[in-house]
Interface confidence: low
């Protein structure tokens, strides 16, 4: 999916005002240096495109985002102000309820939401230019 | 736990130059912008500018453009302000702060105890 | 350059007295933030986005607005209470309001 035509404003009030407590959450327990940010974006839609991957694709180690509530704020708000998007995520969805496993929270899955965190930041601040 | 430990005292000449450092630990020094702020005696806080340990990338109040550079130095997690032309207006306690967007509207949430400059002649 | 005015400039009350600290912004911002500073002290982040009390901030304290008003709240002030108040918007770029000083009459 090209996140080009979202409306990235809107993206950042719904981050901005539950997504980021909701990660937070997730967190709690877990000290913010504890993992080191390897992910990392270039510009609004490549952050999305990255926030996209790592929230709803499951990894080794870490098959269990996607029904966490961050992962479902973060779909409902993609899906409201990116036109489209909800329309390439049917398939995808329906092949994830039917392979729905029991919720843990691993260290590798507090390490992705870790670098979840470090992108949704440089989602909110596009980088200043340098002068 | 978050620590911004600010290099010690300074008393210039006016027309000089100084340079006030900003030791920063406790957490990932690229992820956070770093502000300078100004606090002359008595007087209200007074933002002179912003920066990006990630690239570099700044941005200055107006009033201070010119005058104030704003660097870092990644591999040593430590911000630096250098202002240069300094007159007997310049004396005030500077601080750098860090600005967190874990909250909302990104607020300066750690500050260092400040740099105490002096221009006199 | 967003200009932010604070009133008072002085609030002089009695412990146990309600304060009430406004900030008026020159054109509309999406959140404030509060500082508190003491003499010879960095100032601290006391309340976040508005509302939202930074940690170790008492209950007592409470922030409000939205728009170009802004109104941070003591509703029953304690000596540990008196200090310097001020606000900062980061709508565009980023300024601080002159400061209100809450003193003991």
């Known amino acids: 999916y090209d996140f080009t035509n979202c409306d990235f404003e809107k993206i950042k009030a719904a981050y901005l005002s539950t997504i980021s407590k909701d990660l937070i959450t997730y967190m709690s327990g877990t000290k913010s240096t504890e993992f080191n940010n390897t992910v990392s974006c270039s510009n609004r839609p490549h952050c999305l495109t990255e926030i996209q991957s790592l929230t709803f694709n499951p990894t080794a180690g870490c098959a269990s985002l996607a029904k966490e509530m961050f992962a479902m704020k973060t779909k409902a708000a993609l899906a409201i102000w990116c036109p489209g998007y909800s329309e390439t995520q049917i398939n995808a969805t329906q092949a994830m309820k039917k392979r729905r496993k029991r919720k843990v929270t691993t260290n590798k899955c507090l390490e992705q939401v870790s670098q979840l965190q470090g992108l949704w930041r440089r989602f909110n601040r596009p980088l200043l230019k340098q002068q | 736990e978050v620590q911004l430990v600010q290099s010690g005292a300074e008393v210039k000449k006016p027309g000089a130059s100084v340079k006030v450092s900003c030791k920063a630990s406790g957490y990932t020094f690229t992820d956070d912008y770093m502000n300078w702020v100004k606090q002359a005696p008595g007087q209200r806080l007074e933002w002179i500018g912003i920066i990006s340990p990630y690239n570099g990338g700044t941005s200055y109040n107006q009033k201070f453009k010119g005058r104030a550079t704003l660097t870092v130095d990644k591999s040593a997690s430590t911000a630096y302000m250098e202002l240069s032309s300094l007159r007997s207006e310049d004396t005030a306690v500077y601080y750098c702060?860090?600005?967190?967007?874990?909250?909302?509207?990104?607020?300066?949430?750690?500050w260092g105890q400040g740099t105490t400059v002096t221009v006199s002649s | 350059e967003i200009v932010l005015t604070q009133s008072p400039a002085t609030l002089s009350l009695s412990p146990g007295e309600r304060a009430t600290l406004s900030c008026r912004a020159s054109?509309?911002?999406?959140?404030m933030h509060w500082y508190q500073q003491k003499p010879g002290q960095a100032p601290r982040p006391w309340i976040y986005a508005t509302s939202n009390l930074a940690s170790g901030v008492p209950a007592r304290f409470s922030g409000s607005g939205s728009g170009t008003s802004y109104t941070l709240t003591i509703s029953r002030l304690e000596p540990e209470d008196f200090a310097v108040y001020y606000c900062?918007?980061?709508?565009?770029?980023?300024?601080f309001g002159g400061g209100t000083k809450v003193e003991i009459k």
């Open positions: 054109s509309s911002v999406s959140y």
């Open positions: 900062q918007q980061w709508s565009s770029n980023r300024t």
């Open positions: 702060a860090r600005e967190d967007y874990d909250y909302d509207g990104y607020a300066m949430d750690h």
